[in-house]
Amino acid sequence: AAPCPDACCPHGSSGLRCTRDGALDSLHHLPGAENLTELYIENQQHLQHLELRDLRGLGELRNLTIVKSGLRFVAPDAFHFTPRLSRLNLSFNALESLSWKTVQGLSLQELVLSGNPLHCSCALRWLQRWEEEGLGGVPEQKLQCHGQGPLAHMPNASCGVPTLKVQVPNASVDVGDDVLLRCQVEGRGLEQAGWILTELEQSATVMKSGGLPSLGLTLANVTSDLNRKNVTCWAENDVGRAEVSVQVNVSFPASVQLHTAVEMHHWCIPFSVDGQPAPSLRWLFNGSVLNETSFIFTEFLEPAANETVRHGCLRLNQPTHVNNGNYTLLAANPFGQASASIMAAFMDNPFEFNPEDPIPVSFSPVDTNSTSGDPVEKKDETPFGVSVAVG
């Protein structure tokens, strides 16, 4: 094959080599960029900056080598468009620092920075940590800071990510209230801070206020959906990023739903209860308190992390005719009480049938369901205890 006269020449099926002295000052308009998996650049003294726009369109890039060139600055977001990058060699350039943000989100198996005039500061604390933890092949490079000695020896006592404190209201929050949250940010070299509110959706109207070091957030006209939702404050400095999540508990009355009994491995009377604080539950059978035993007891499903509603079963193990009757679930919290009832028939009474009739075996539960979801104030009803005497 004839020698390639261009600044950059194909290398293999999806590689590109740019080694002609001083031919590049940026990486715009590289030929066949969208399919490149490997890019090798050498001896490019005029290539001093690597920025987001330089690598746009290189979505398939796996290996990037820029060596013996003039690289002085790599933007924190330079590799945003190259999420598959796994090997990055920037050795023998003019880099004094490299932000932690540059490599965040990448799964780098190899990062080579030897031969750069690195300046030891807290901004390289992340790289020092990689060296300590044996990541990316960094320890083998024995990185030096220009005129300061080994990177490994850099003092790091004062190199911490920001410290965050989020203040939430002490008092009970009710549906329709406005809630003010404040995030206090402390630390050196603060760069950015903000709120992450992705979970909130329609749970409240959001208004942000203030800036570093004190960020305010007003959640107006809150709904009960706000419960179990994370409100996250974040802040960044040259060392890294910190996040703190809080949840606002919005009080609302107990509610309850009962469903027709179903036969599984055992019988189950399905229920759903909601309320904040979580309501206490009490079962009645034909109007009398039902004490739970190994034959009849409440089982909860695993709760969803982001909602207050609890689903479960009144589990009945091999129920007989003596278990036929009216089941009522009472749910109560300080803001109200609700109840729901359902008739269940598990088996005919073997002692009550006409001798001329066929012998009954069993039949499905009667489908009678009455639910009163509206809370009723009954302060004298106390939640039941969990320890009962028998005998």
Partner: antibody, heavy 117, light 109 residues
Framework: QVQLQQSGAELMKPGASVKISCKTT????????IEWVKQRPGHGLEWLGE????????NYNENFRGKATFTADTSSNTAYVQLSSLTSEDSAVYFC??????????WGAGTTVTVSS | QAVVTQESALTTSPGETVTLTCRSS?????????ANWVQEKPDHLFTGLIG???NRPPGVPARFSGSLIGDKAALTITGAQTEDEAIYFC?????????FGGGTKLTVL
């Protein structure tokens, strides 16, 4: 495979308390009731009560209320019974059993408690 | 509290069928008593044989069966074997607690 491993034999003084453990393996501890049973020669088997570890629901046989206290540690999958104010009447072998109604279930090997001055 | 009564001892021969019974002081034993039968062998080795009157858990030989006979719960061993020599306890459920019978010592010779 469901297994219940009980703690070793205990020799106690009258008036003392003893705590017997029942470590379970092979199933989801929090979801099944644990029964406690006492066996004394000449007195057969007596049911002390039951506990549902995941919810802390406890049912005591009235004859043993105040004598036996059931607890459970879901982090170690272990159930406990504490017997207080021991007398010679409490000398017995104590069993835990995992119940899966209507089956009384899988039994531990028993813990012998001897009360003697 | 209810009293559960069993035969104190029974003797059978290998291959024979033997029935152990269990009576309740409160009246007829019903399916709501969830009669269980538990076998005790030497060194406090307990095994559940029957639960809920007539349910056999996995691993229990088919020669063991449970039923209600008249007003009593019954355990029948069809084709007894020498290894069935043991004490058999009946356990009945009374709404919120279990009561054990005194046990039947079964000898197979």
């Amino acid at each position: 495979q469901v297994q219940l491993q009980q703690s070793g034999a205990e020799l106690m003084k009258p008036g003392a308390s003893v705590k017997i453990s029942c470590k379970t393996t092979g199933y989801r501890f929090s979801s099944y009731w644990i029964e406690w049973v006492k066996q004394r020669p000449g007195h057969g088997l007596e049911w002390l009560g039951e506990i549902l570890p995941g919810r802390g629901i406890i049912n005591y046989n009235e004859n043993f209320r105040g004598k036996a206290t059931f607890t459970a540690d879901t982090s170690s999958n272990t159930a406990y019974v504490q017997l207080s104010s021991l007398t010679s009447e409490d000398s017995a072998v104590y069993f835990c059993a995992r119940t899966d109604p209507p089956y009384f279930g899988v039994w531990g090997a028993g813990t012998t408690v001897t009360v003697s001055s | 509290q209810a009293v559960v009564t069993q035969e104190s001892a029974l003797t059978t021969s290998p291959g024979e069928t033997v029935t152990l019974t269990c009576r309740s002081s409160t009246g007829a034993v019903t399916i709501s008593n969830y009669a269980n039968w538990v076998q005790e062998k030497p060194d406090h080795l307990f095994t559940g044989l029957i639960g809920g009157t007539n349910n056999r858990p996995p691993g229990v030989p088919a020669r063991f069966s449970g039923s209600l006979i008249g007003d009593k719960a019954a355990l029948t061993i069809t084709g007894a074997q020498t290894e069935d020599e043991a004490i058999y306890f009946c356990v009945l459920w009374y709404s919120n607690h279990w009561v054990f019978g005194g046990g039947t010592k079964l000898t197979v010779l």
